[in-house]
Interface confidence: low
């Protein structure tokens, strides 16, 4: 009679975490007499998964009724699969012996791989804001997936980025894996409304990748441009001086007017106008009573934006160019009349 063969028809199977795995095994003969055992791994240290005769295996059930006299199907089903169950499973026939059974023949093995979904990617940016033209780093992390093969892409406003480095850990065997990627992004002045997206594709996601996003509004600081101008007003001895603060982000801004280096007024930006690109504009103005000045006046608009060192713009007001009222050197009242910002 032909010698017994142990047939494991599936070279490999892949199962999603939480599902059941069926491991098929049939034998071609009822001889020799002896039990079947299932192991994970081969050689030293193999792990017993199921023993036909004894032991408690709560997650393992047999597909066929092993008590039937002519049964030759020793397939098993393992319930509630987790990534820790991955490995190669062997169906092994033993020959009855005394005192111990003797291993007679092993199946070729079925490699079980477990598919576990990655967690939603978490994208984080730098701790401090940066200005346009600077390169900033974003990190993306996702955990708990299996198998190890995974694809990660970075996008900025739909455009794929190429400057990034990705690691999958651990390098060797693990029940599940984590991915960590760092992308470098060059900021531009138009990036207030921009988004950085980390996209993770994995076999468990059926072509519907997971995405994590970061808004560059949390990262960028666009410093303002200043322009100081003067317009005459109807009153002959008054000049309206305005400080236009343009294209800044975020909103936090404090403006100080200086007259010949001395603080005249400080105000905090309030009623801002928003530009299409997400930056803001603001204007502050002063009414200058020219008749109160004997000499030329240096007016400085000094702006402190988002806690950064102050930037300033000055304007020289030529007093000599304006007609003086009689007795203007003793004229009462302030030299500078402050006005609420527009």
């Amino acid at each position: 009679e032909e010698e017994l063969q142990v047939i494991q028809p599936d070279k490999s199977i892949s199962v999603a975490a939480g599902e059941s795995a069926t491991l098929h095994c049939t034998v071609t003969s009822l001889i020799p007499v002896g039990p079947i055992q299932w192991f994970r791994g081969a050689g030293p240290g193999r792990e017993l998964i199921y023993n036909q005769k004894e032991g408690h295996f709560p997650r393992v059930t047999t597909v066929s009724d092993l008590t039937k006299r002519n049964n030759m199907d020793f397939s098993i089903r393992i319930s509630n699969i987790t990534p820790a169950d991955a490995g190669t499973y062997y169906c092994v026939k033993f020959r009855k012996g005394s005192p111990d059974h003797v291993e007679f023949k092993s199946g070729a093995g079925t490699e079980l791989s477990v598919r576990a979904k990655p967690s939603a990617p978490v994208v984080s940016g730098p701790a401090a804001r940066a200005t346009p033209q600077h390169t900033v780093s974003f990190t993306c992390e996702s955990h708990g997936f299996s198998p190890r093969d995974i694809t990660l892409k970075w996008f900025k406003n739909g455009n794929e980025l190429s400057d990034f480095q990705t690691n999958v850990d651990p390098a060797g065997d693990s029940v599940s894996y984590s991915i960590h990627s760092t992308a470098k992004v060059v900021l531009t002045r138009e990036d207030v409304h921009s988004q950085v997206i980390c996209e993770v594709a994995h076999v468990t996601l059926q072509g519907d990748p997971l995405r994590g996003t970061a808004n560059l509004s949390e990262t960028i600081r666009v410093p303002p441009t200043l322009e100081v101008t003067q317009q005459p007003v109807r009153a002959e001895n008054q000049v309206n001086v305005t400080c236009q603060v343009r294209k800044f982000y975020p909103q936090r801004l404090q403006l100080t007017w200086l007259e010949n280096g001395n603080v005249s007024r400080t105000e905090t930006a309030s009623t801002l106008t928003e530009n299409k690109d997400g930056t803001y504009n603001w204007m502050s103005w002063l009414l200058v009573n020219v008749s109160a000045h004997r000499d030329d006046v240096k007016l400085t608009c000094q702006v402190e934006h988002d806690g950064q060192p102050a930037v300033s713009k000055s304007h020289d007001l030529k007093v000599s160019a304006h007609p003086k009222e009689q007795g203007s050197n003793t004229a009462p009242g302030p030299a500078l009349a402050s006005a609420a910002p527009l």
Epitope: R40, G41, A42, G43, P44, G45, R46, E47, P83, A84, D85, A86, G87, T88, E111, L112, S113, R148, D169, P170, A171, G172, D173, S174, V175
Partner: antibody, heavy 122, light 107 residues
């Protein structure tokens, strides 16, 4: 039976390079990570890095980056480690050992090569 | 990196003694720890995997226990062939790291 057979002892001059080999037999070579471990004379064991023959994916201990380069020849079931810019402190026995790709605790570092002694001397 | 601190670094014992070696991980490694035995001039040999599972052919006087960060290798009754150096090895996270070793010598 699984066997890892390593190349013979090497005596090399400082500044030179050496390439060690580790041939696997008795199992599917590609479904395991091949690791390399250093043991300096009278010292303990240090993990250098590992390579996965399926796609030549490598991982290194930061300490050995730039010192060790791991490669494989799948057709010959052989893993290689090249050590460069050798110095006296690289004198050691280098072992190859292997671990399973999936979560099979039983297959971690059970099989070891016999070791290759590298002596760096002028 | 995960640091593995092994103690003692050496010990003297007699045949028949009970010997305990401990290994502490700097962070949780679950049960992913091996114990290896190495004799002079030989490659390491794994005795225990996954903290407490005995390799086939390893005498039952060897046992392992612990989880998380604290692990123990126990030799219940030391035999002449057990005089060697023992290492713990974590394989939970790359880079994989070994303990510093414990040399078991004859008293």
């Amino acid at each position: 039976e699984v066997q890892l057979v390593q190349s013979g002892a090497e005596v090399v001059k400082p500044g030179a390079s050496v390439k060690l080999s580790c041939k696997a037999s008795g199992s599917t070579f590609t479904s395991y990570w091949m690791h390399w471990v250093k043991q300096a004379p009278g010292q303990g064991l240090e993990w250098i890095g590992a390579i996965y023959p399926v796609n030549s994916d490598t991982t290194y201990n930061q300490k050995f980056k730039g010192k060790a380069t791991l490669t494989v020849d799948k057709s010959a079931s052989t893993a290689y480690m090249e050590l460069s810019s050798l110095r006296s402190e690289d004198t050691a026995v280098y072992y190859c050992t292997r671990s399973f790709y999936y979560s099979l605790d039983a297959a971690w570092f059970v099989y070891w090569g016999q070791g290759t002694l590298v002596t760096v001397s002028s | 990196d995960i640091q593995m601190t092994q103690s003692p670094s050496s010990l003297s014992a007699s045949v028949g003694d009970r010997v305990t070696i401990t290994c502490r991980a700097s962070q949780d490694i679950g049960s992913r720890l091996n114990w290896l035995q190495q004799k002079p001039g030989k490659a390491p040999k794994r005795l225990i995997y996954a903290t407490s599972s005995l390799d086939s052919g390893v005498p039952s006087r060897f046992s392992g226990s612990g989880s998380g960060t604290e692990f123990t290798l126990t030799i219940s009754s030391l035999q002449p062939e057990d005089f060697a150096t023992y290492y713990c090895l974590q394989y939970a996270s790359s880079p994989f790291t070994f303990g510093g070793g414990t040399k078991v010598e004859i008293k």
